[in-house]
Structures are given as structure tokens and as C-alpha cells.
């Protein structure tokens, strides 16, 4: 912490600009004015302050604000940000999606930070929801945000959000997230003809049930291997040849080259060896012909 | 050991533009800010300006503004001047040099860029 | 901005003998920082915040002043110390540097 010293003759900042950048730090916390510098904050991001310089100015705004600072000061504070801890922002009350995108735009380019995460979290709590607005900003600057979020925390979103989402903001989302946001983009989408509602709905199917699925497979609409991948096991399961034939389409001859792995290799084991060479692939391990095939989900449902 | 290395010299027309590097390393280089100081012909020194590596936010000796441009890459650790519209006047060493911590003077000088503005 | 005069523009010294050169600013500054220069190199760091002497400065070296009034002081010249001498300060923007002293061996 700086010792408080009384500011040299003539050194007295007026106004905050370039000529504070070889102030020392006491003399930047002896001559500059914390309320000056809260009502010029937007100067600050202009003017080339080293890290030590910067750590001055933030002190002089704890002091000026224990509390937390205002939204307007927040608004610019540039690259000060990088200079709070998560602590720090829990004080804040940020509301303007402005405020939000400021901030976020020093960050650009860096991983999410804990500072970042937790402005994240203060700004949403604050608007009660996920809103469309929010979740565009968001995902500009951070495509993987909302695989981030809990499954909780994705059942706030609303359905008309769900417009903002690019296939690449759900390249880390594990099933369990794609389960809540699926119905929601269902919902969002139903009013599109098919082959548009297949594009926009490709990315959420790693959350449809087989009936879904099923529904799909009479579009048409030749469903790429990567989608294919990373639908349900369980949803898969039932599905027969011919349904994956039509869900597929061209792609069908894709699923040779993934016999072996999760859901092909599940789906294969419980299909008749018979309608598998239909598909003329050399798919093997499916039941052999004679064998009967009991559903025991089925008796355990009606037990 | 810290090491401020210049591009070499630079032979230029009047009227043209240069752009001079200074490559960094032994250090963090977003840590310390970088200074641009001319010398010409052996008489004393001139400051031009000053860049924060991290932020890219710049500071002009008011003599310099709209001569001198201070950019930095990050990537290569490397910061550099463009001098444009180049006249005899330009014709010097130019020296970037790092701050000191806390405003304790510039610690470490590059070689120097010798400039020389020529038809 | 801040003009900084250093006198002598030229001196000499034998060895062993104390030398000062000054630098006198046109306003007042809290510190000066000074550099050597040798011909055909870059100028070193050599006293900063006044009185503080850079890494490898020999001990024979010293720096005071306040105000306006700045001194660089050798209490006994030696061959390797001449050299060009500049002082420079930041307190005032834009930083500015003295015109030198050019200190040379008799």
C-alpha cells in the first residue's frame, strides 16, 4: 500500500491525462483526486499507466467506494477491470448490457476469467433471466458460455434465446446440458418448414428423445455422421435399420467406419443381423436370424 | 540478460516512411513500458514517446504526434516506431528504451536505429 | 515543458580529481535521472531518482539536488569515466533531457 504523502508543488492533477504517466506511485496517490478520477475514468483506458500505476488507481476508487462502484464508473473502467478481483465485482450492481459489453471487450481474446465469470453471474442474477440480448453478447465473446452453465442455470433461458445460439457455442456441451436446451429450441423452432427446422435444430439433437428422432428420419433430411455421433446411446437404441437408413440418407455408408464406437456399437448389437445386411455396409454383430429378441424394458414397464 | 535489439540502419528518401523494431527478451515484456528517445547527429537526447505493451495505449511528446507511431506485437515481444513523411530533419538515432519500475528512469536502451534521410 | 541546462557544456579532469557538473531545471522537479554516453553507443542509465546509483555504477559516483538545482558528482576521476553526461526528468510532461556535459580525461 502506498504511504500517504502530501502531493509536491505544482503537481496537482487537473485533469487525468497523459502527463500523470511518469508520476510515481505516491505522487499519483498524492495528487490525484479519487472523485476526479471517478468522473474521468474514460481517460484512463487512453493513457499508457503501468501496472503499479494502475493498482494506485484502483486503491484511490476502493477508497472513494468501499460499497462497490457505481454503474457509471464501472461503464469505463477499461482496462482497471483486469485489475478487480471476483471479490469486487460481488459489490457491484451492473444492469446496463453496455456496462457488459465494455467490459467484456477488454477481456476479448483471453480465456473467461474468474473476474469475468463472476460479472457474468452479477449481471444475470440481476436481469432474473438469460434474455436473447444477453446470451448474443455473451457468445460473441465467448462461444463456449453457455456449456458453462449448469442444467439448472440453462432452464432460465428462454426459448426465444435460443435464436442467438451458433452451432460452435455447443461444441462443449455435454448431454445433459444439450437435455435442457433441446425442448427450448424445439419450441423456438417449431414453426419452421423441415429442411430449415433440420439446420437450426442439427445442433441441439444430442438432447432429443428416439420419438424425435423417429419423426425426423421421414423428413429427408440426410443427417451427417458428426450429428449422428453425438445423439442419445439411449435414444438411438430403438430405432430400426430402416429409420437410420432414412435419417441418414447418403451418410449411411459412414456408419462402417464407426462400427466400433458409442451409439453405432450399441445400436448395432441390438439390431437383427438380417436387416443390417440390408444396408450392404458389412455391419457385423448384430442377433443372428433364429434368435428371439425380448424387450425387457418393455416387461418391466408392465410389471 | 535483458536485450533491446534494433532493426539495422535505414537509408530513406524524403518524403517516405520507416518503421523500426526493437525486439525484446530476458523480461515479461507486457510488464514495463517501452520509450522512443532521438539523437541527432551526436547532440542531446529528445523523448518521442511511450507504449504500454499490454494495453497497446501510447503517450507523445507533443513534437511527435502525427510523425511518430508507437505499435507493439505481443507475440514476438517486439515494439516498433513508423516514422512517416520523412524529411532531413528526421535524420538521427532512434533509441527505444525500457522504463524503470516506478518511474526510475529508462534502465535499458536498445543499440540504436540510424536514420538518414537522403535523395 | 521543463528545460533542462547542464554546465559545463565541456570539461576535463585529471586523475583523481573530484568533479561536478549541474543541470538546472526552468521549473521545479522532484527527481532527476542521469545518463552516460559514450561515443558510438547507446546512452546507460547511470544515477536515477536523484541520488540512486544504476547496477555497476561505481561507488565514486554520486547524484544530489532538490527543487531546480541537480548535481552529478565524482569524487576521483578515472580514465573510463569520460564520457558525455545527460540529465533528464519526468516530473513535468513531456520528459526532457540536458543539453549534456562532455567530461573528458586530461
Known amino acids: 500500500e502506498v504511504e500517504k504523502t502530501a502531493c509536491p508543488s505544482g503537481k496537482k492533477a487537473r485533469e487525468i491525462d497523459e502527463s500523470l504517466i511518469f508520476y510515481k506511485k505516491w505522487e499519483l496517490e498524492a495528487c490525484v483526486d479519487a472523485a476526479l478520477l471517478a468522473t474521468q475514468m474514460d481517460r484512463v483506458n487512453a493513457i499508457p499507466f503501468t501496472y503499479e500505476q494502475l493498482d494506485v488507481l484502483k486503491h484511490k476508487l476502493d477508497e472513494l467506494y468501499p460499497q462497490g462502484y457505481p454503474e457509471s464508473v464501472i461503464q469505463h473502467l477499461g482496462y482497471l477491470f483486469l485489475k478487480m478481483s471476483p471479490e469486487d465485482i460481488r459489490k457491484w450492481n451492473v444492469t446496463s448490457l453496455e456496462t457488459l459489453k465494455a467490459l467484456l471487450e477488454v477481456n476479448k481474446g483471453h480465456e473467461m476469467s474468474p473476474q469475468v465469470a463472476t460479472l457474468i453471474d452479477r449481471f444475470v442474477k440481476g436481469r432474473g433471466q438469460l434474455d436473447k440480448d444477453t446470451l448474443d453478447t455473451l457468445t460473441a465473446f465467448y462461444p463456449g458460455y453457455l456449456c458453462s452453465l449448469s442444467p439448472e442455470e440453462l432452464s432460465s433461458v428462454p426459448p426465444s434465446s435460443i435464436w442467438a445460439v451458433r452451432p460452435q457455442d455447443l461444441d462443449t456441451c455435454d448431454p445433459r446440458q444439450l437435455d435442457v436446451l433441446y425442448p427450448k429450441a424445439r419450441l423456438a423452432f417449431q414453426n419452421m418448414n423441415g429442411s430449415e427446422y433440420f439446420v437450426k435444430i442439427q445442433s441441439f439433437l444430442g438432447g432429443a428423445p428416439t420419438e424425435d428422432l423417429k419423426a425426423l428420419s421421414q423428413q429427408n433430411v440426410s443427417m451427417d455422421l458428426a450429428t449422428f455421433m453425438k445423439l442419445r446411446t439411449d435414444a438411438v437404441l430403438p430405432l430400426t435399420v430402416a429409420e437410420v437408413q432414412k435419417l441418414l440418407g447418403p451418410h449411411v455408408e459412414g456408419l462402417k467406419a464407426e462400427e466400433r464406437h458409442r451409439p453405432v456399437r450399441d445400436w448395432i448389437l441390438r439390431q437383427r443381423q438380417d436387416d443390417l445386411d440390408t444396408l450392404g455396409l458389412g455391419l457385423q454383430g448384430g442377433i443372428p436370424n433364429g434368435y428371439l429378441v425380448l424387450d425387457l424394458s418393455m416387461q418391466e414397464a408392465l410389471s | 540478460e535483458f536485450q533491446l535489439q534494433q532493426s539495422g540502419p535505414e537509408l530513406v528518401k524524403p518524403g517516405a516512411s520507416v518503421k523500426i523494431s526493437c525486439k525484446t527478451s530476458?523480461?515479461?515484456?507486457?510488464?514495463?513500458?517501452m520509450n522512443w528517445v532521438k539523437q541527432s547527429n551526436g547532440k542531446s537526447l529528445e523523448w518521442i514517446g511511450v507504449?504500454?505493451?499490454?494495453?497497446?495505449?501510447?503517450g507523445y511528446n507533443q513534437k511527435f504526434k502525427g510523425k511518430a507511431t508507437l505499435t507493439v506485437d505481443q507475440s514476438s515481444s517486439t515494439a516498433y516506431m513508423q516514422l512517416n513523411s520523412l524529411t532531413s530533419e528526421d535524420s538521427a538515432v532512434y533509441y527505444c528504451?525500457?522504463?524503470?519500475?516506478?518511474?526510475?528512469?529508462?534502465?535499458?536502451w536498445g543499440h540504436g536505429t540510424s536514420v538518414t534521410v537522403s535523395s | 515543458q521543463i528545460v533542462l541546462t547542464q554546465s559545463p557544456a565541456i570539461m576535463s579532469a585529471s586523475p583523481g580529481e573530484k568533479v561536478t557538473m549541474t543541470c538546472s531545471a526552468s521549473?521545479?522537479?522532484?527527481?532527476m535521472h542521469w545518463y552516460q554516453q559514450k561515443s558510438g553507443t547507446s546512452p546507460k542509465r547511470w544515477i536515477y531518482?536523484?541520488?540512486k546509483l544504476a547496477s555497476g555504477v561505481p561507488a565514486r559516483f554520486s547524484g544530489s539536488g532538490s527543487g531546480t538545482s541537480y548535481s552529478l558528482t565524482i569524487s576521483s576521476m578515472e580514465a573510463e569515466d569520460a564520457a558525455t553526461y545527460y540529465c533528464?526528468?519526468?516530473?513535468?510532461?513531456?520528459?526532457?533531457f540536458g543539453g549534456g556535459t562532455k567530461l573528458e580525461i586530461k
Open positions: 528504451a525500457r522504463g524503470g519500475y516506478d518511474g526510475e528512469a529508462m534502465d535499458y
Open positions: 530476458g523480461y515479461s515484456f507486457t510488464d514495463y513500458n
Open positions: 507504449i504500454n505493451p499490454n494495453y497497446g495505449t501510447t
Open positions: 521549473s521545479s522537479v522532484n527527481y
Open positions: 531518482d536523484t541520488s
Open positions: 533528464q526528468q519526468w516530473s513535468s510532461y513531456p520528459p526532457t
